[in-house]
């Protein structure tokens, strides 16, 4: 499975979109987990609403928010106030009973904000209004790389 690499600026938000076959995954909740090492388990960070029909409602765990558009087949995860410790390998998962199917692997890289070393003055932007969406924002880049990490559940 390819790994998508997403970069975000420290202190800002990074938005991850995982697409899937909406009919194949009908009725299934989605989750975002962090993989602990190359061979390690994937530790659940947040999952969508327990009632599948309400999966569009945002669920939050700390600074991570998840919401699922089950008709379009897109689950969106937002990592707010990105910190260096948020860097690492994650998975979007589709949950079916005890099973977790990997929809996408995502490597999150956190870039230091160059303004951290200067007096930002009036250039500071509130965190809520600075949201990166994958490669769609100028200083958030996305690339694919082949990895040998096994799917974990």
């Amino acid at each position: 499975l390819n790994t998508t690499v997403l970069q975000g600026m420290a202190g800002q938000s990074l938005r991850v979109s995982c697409t899937y076959d909406a009919l194949k995954h009908w009725g299934r909740r989605k989750a975002w987990c962090r993989q602990l090492g190359e061979e390690g388990p994937c530790q659940r960070v947040v999952s969508t609403h327990g009632v599948w029909l309400l999966a569009f409602l945002k669920k939050r765990n700390g600074s991570t928010v998840i919401a699922d558009d089950t008709l379009a087949g897109t689950v969106t995860i937002t990592l707010k106030n990105l910190q260096a410790g948020d860097a690492g390998l994650y998975q979007c998962q589709s949950l079916r009973g005890r099973e977790a199917e990997v929809l996408q692997k995502v490597l999150v890289e956190v870039l230091e904000d160059p303004l951290d070393d200067q007096d930002a003055g009036d250039l500071w932007v509130p965190e809520e209004s600075s949201s990166f969406e994958g490669a769609q924002v100028e200083h958030s880049t996305s690339r694919n790389q082949e990895t040998s990490f096994p799917p974990t559940s």
Partner: antibody
């Protein structure tokens, strides 16, 4: 009418190959998982595996992994179960069944084929 | 693999009586993924109950399912002549999606 129609009974010799079929109609074949279930004479039901015809994603029971191959041709709404080398112990009734779903859950196997009898004897 | 154990193996009852069939899982199973099937001789199985307690389309209300975790029950409130058959439970919480060994409900 939603239905699954299976191919006819087969009589084979040990070592021969075989491919039986299950044709879906009356619904969107590519958007429901299709499972295969074995029932040996006078015995209970055994889950063999399942396939999603939309992308041919397939899962097998460990008991049947490597013993059979499950496939599908979505262009003709048909799922298949095949053996490369039959054994006498493969003698059984084989059912295909649709794994239904609803908003927020799973219906179980809600539509079944009529079954295909496979007899393997020298 | 989750092992599903059904009891009793055979239930001998008369029409009009109540039948209680048990299905026990070797590990906890989400009730969303527990189904019951009926099979008559020479016929394919038929879905009766899904999600542990929901009747499938066209199933009479004398059939009901209950339970959670590892213990599930299928109840037929008043047996009709056409209810004498073999009943199977199945979990599809975790692959392989195993069936129980079946309970035969026979006429006493």
């Amino acid at each position: 009418e939603v239905q699954l129609v299976q191919s006819g009974a087969e009589v084979k010799k040990p070592g021969e190959s075989l491919k039986i079929s299950c044709k879906g109609s009356g619904y969107s074949f590519t958007t429901y998982w299709i499972g295969w279930v074995r029932q040996m004479p006078g015995k209970g039901l055994e889950w063999m595996g399942i396939i999603y015809p939309g992308d041919s994603d397939t899962r097998y029971s460990p008991s049947f992994q490597g013993q059979v191959t499950i496939s599908a041709d979505k262009s003709i709404s048909t799922a298949y179960l095949q053996w490369s080398s039959l054994k006498a112990s493969d003698t059984a009734m084989y059912y295909c069944a649709r794994a239904g779903h609803y908003d927020g859950g799973h219906l179980g196997m809600d539509v079944w084929g009529q079954g295909t009898t496979v007899t393997v004897s020298s | 693999e989750i092992v599903m154990t059904q009891s009793p193996g055979t239930l001998s009852l008369s029409p009009g009586e109540r039948a209680t069939l048990s299905c026990r899982a070797s590990q906890s199973v989400s009730s969303s993924y527990l189904a019951w099937y009926q099979q008559k001789p020479g016929q394919a199985p038929r879905l009766l109950i899904y999600g542990a307690s929901n009747r499938a389309t066209g199933i009479p209300d004398r059939f009901s399912g209950s339970g959670s975790g590892t213990d599930f029950t299928l109840t037929i409130s008043r047996l009709e002549p056409e209810d004498f058959a073999v009943y199977y439970c199945q979990q599809d919480d975790s692959a392989p999606y195993t069936f129980g060994g079946g309970t035969k409900v026979e006429i006493k």
